[in-house]
Interface confidence: low
Amino acid sequence: AGVFELQIHSFGPGPGPGAPRSPCSARGPCRLFFRVCLKPGLSEEAAESPCALGAALSARGPVYTEQPEAPAPDLPLPNGLLQVPFRDAWPGTFSLIIETWREELGDQIGGPAWSLLARVTRRRRLAAGGPWARDIQRAGAWELRFSYRARCELLAVGTACTRLCRPRSAPSRCGPGLRPCAPLEDECEAPPVCRAGCSLEHGFCEQPGECRCLEGWTGPLCTVPASTSSCLGLRGPSSATTGCLVPGPGPCDGNPCANGGSCSETPGSFECTCPRGFYGLRCEVSGVTCADGPCFNGGLCVGGADPDSAYICHCPPGFQGSNCEKRVDRCSLQPCRNGGLCLDLGHALRCRCRAGFAGPRCEHNLDDCAGRACANGGTCVEGGGAHRCSCALGFGGRDCRERADPCAARPCAHGGRCYAHFSGLVCACAPGYMGSRCEFPVHPDGVSALPAAPPGLRPGDPQRYL
């Protein structure tokens, strides 16, 4: 676990001619905000792929109103860092996508309008705990200057942040042997010392000197795989009936969750679901009130009405959990229809629709044929949101306005000669061939191998293609 941090230093017109003077449209003032998206690995990912490492949205910047005579400035930016918490190990290689969004503040129907102003993508290798990396990127006519780093939260050891403690405000790192902080404590938490030699990976303890095994492991130090050890004559606790090693207790055996918490097994471990008023790895921490600030991510804390419910967190959109500690990946529900791109802006979801679709969820298929007449007898066809004309013979192009030469593709086979005709084309077949495209050979006895010529047409006569 840890935090990826992005500091935007400046965003403004790039060097050179044609640089925009203002990010705002002619409709009036606007302000900027930024969205950062992190994806693991260095591979070129589709823009629509999820931000698997996390995403964050900045606050809105100050309102910008263009001064007609003033030189184009660096634009006023939101204050502070963009921080993307990551829960698991830092992957080291990642894709960084930074989007600059414009919020127009003019008289918009239905409130402010958002539009994507610039998007930069960088594929990078970065070790956690390292210094700030600086970068300058151009996106179209805009230039973005920024710095970024990944830092482990507290026990900043190693480049992947594999064991950590996360407080809300704290010095550089936890000391040795500390497990992650209880979610609401501003500090690190020290678990008990286990029996000497108790397996780091497969054992745990709740009391000093204890060594309890996770599911699938056994032995006094939890070092023996339960599935392979039975009846192999290994020393250890055994069953009187079989002489086999007894599998170690499952993670939830004896219910490690205190204070009425319910235990559920997870791969190789367990998870406690705590009743309100308790938290911590094993629901061991109690007595929390709103004064302790238990609601994360802007959640509103309300004092509970009964003693069993010391507080209740009302979570803002996009967060859930008894402490609003879990981010809801609302885009994972794929709310955007018809291939629209989902953007979780924090305060709201937005769908960026593909051409031909509209609506909050891209649910409306725009009638591209409305007001789009196809010329020269062509008919308009809707398909996938794209306007297309099916043109009459002899015409082509997007709107059937271009005259097409039907003979250009040399449609007459076996040396037949092509003639353009008002309703299509006519093939004059070479001797020995017949058919609308001169595709059928004529037998020497005058009988064709395939369908006979229509009445009134002899082999060799021009065949008009209807």
């Epitope: 050891v157 064991r163 500390l178 500090e187 020290a190 008990p192 108790c198 780091l200």
Partner: antibody, heavy 119, light 107 residues
Framework: EVQLVESGGGLVQPGGSLRLSCAAS????????MHWVRQAPGKGLEWVAY????????SYADSVKGRFTISADTSKNTAYLQMNSLRAEDTAVYYC????????????WGQGTLVTVSS | DIQMTQSPSSLSASVGDRVTITCRAS??????VAWYQQKPGKAPKLLIY???SLYSGVPSRFSGSRSGTDFTLTISSLQPEDFATYYC?????????FGQGTKVEIK
């Protein structure tokens, strides 16, 4: 039975080097924090460094950073402290101590080895 | 670095006395505080971990408590073998730091 035995101490001149060893028995150092703590004559305890061998995690006190290096050989179940650029103020009894993965304290200590830095 | 300010630096007491030693952390160190006993020429011994948990084999007359950033080691009834120097230690943040020690002497 858990046991820690330090060795390698002695008299060394300022600017010199010394390598301390801490041989562990009765437990596996790979899943424990191995600490070095020192105590100057007549003074209190001062933490020097730790290593967590499984992941190669290390941490140092500011006073020794860049001069001392902690390491471990899990095949020999031994932790080491390489001390370079030694100063008079490094003179102390150096203790090796164990801290469990699940635990912040130091539950087993060696008997200590004396390092004297003097010309 | 976190300072652990231990007081008193020395005290004189008699067998059977109740003895209290305190340690104040310069900032929050959670409960990651341990107490050690050291006798002359010997290595320290762990008494208390996690601020208030009694380590295996340590007599129950030793106890630890925490109040905010103040940590207390109490010996409820001092015994002859308890005359020694006591150290607190925090392991919440690196670098690990010790208090300067409290020497408990016979009155």
């Amino acid at each position: 039975e858990v046991q820690l035995v330090e060795s390698g101490g002695g008299l060394v001149q300022p600017g010199g080097s010394l390598r301390l060893s801490c041989a562990a028995s009765g437990f596996n150092i790979s899943s424990s924090y191995m600490h070095w703590v020192r105590q100057a004559p007549g003074k209190g305890l001062e933490w020097v460094a730790y290593i967590y061998p499984s992941y190669g995690y290390t941490s140092y006190a500011d006073s020794v950073k860049g001069r001392f290096t902690i390491s471990a050989d899990t095949s020999k179940n031994t932790a080491y402290l390489q001390m370079n650029s030694l100063r008079a103020e490094d003179t102390a009894v150096y203790y090796c101590a164990r801290g469990g993965y699940y635990y912040h304290g130091m539950d087993y200590w060696g008997q200590g080895t004396l390092v004297t830095v003097s010309s | 670095d976190i300072q652990m300010t231990q007081s008193p630096s020395s005290l004189s007491a008699s067998v059977g006395d109740r003895v209290t030693i305190t340690c104040r952390a310069s900032q929050s160190v959670s409960s990651a505080v341990a107490w050690y006993q050291q006798k002359p020429g010997k290595a320290p011994k762990l008494l208390i971990y996690s601020a208030s948990s009694l380590y295996s084999g340590v007599p129950s007359r030793f106890s630890g408590s925490r109040s905010g950033t103040d940590f207390t080691l109490t010996i409820s009834s001092l015994q002859p073998e308890d005359f020694a120097t006591y150290y607190c230690q925090q392991a919440s943040w690196s670098p690990i730091t010790f208090g300067q020690g409290t020497k408990v002497e016979i009155k």
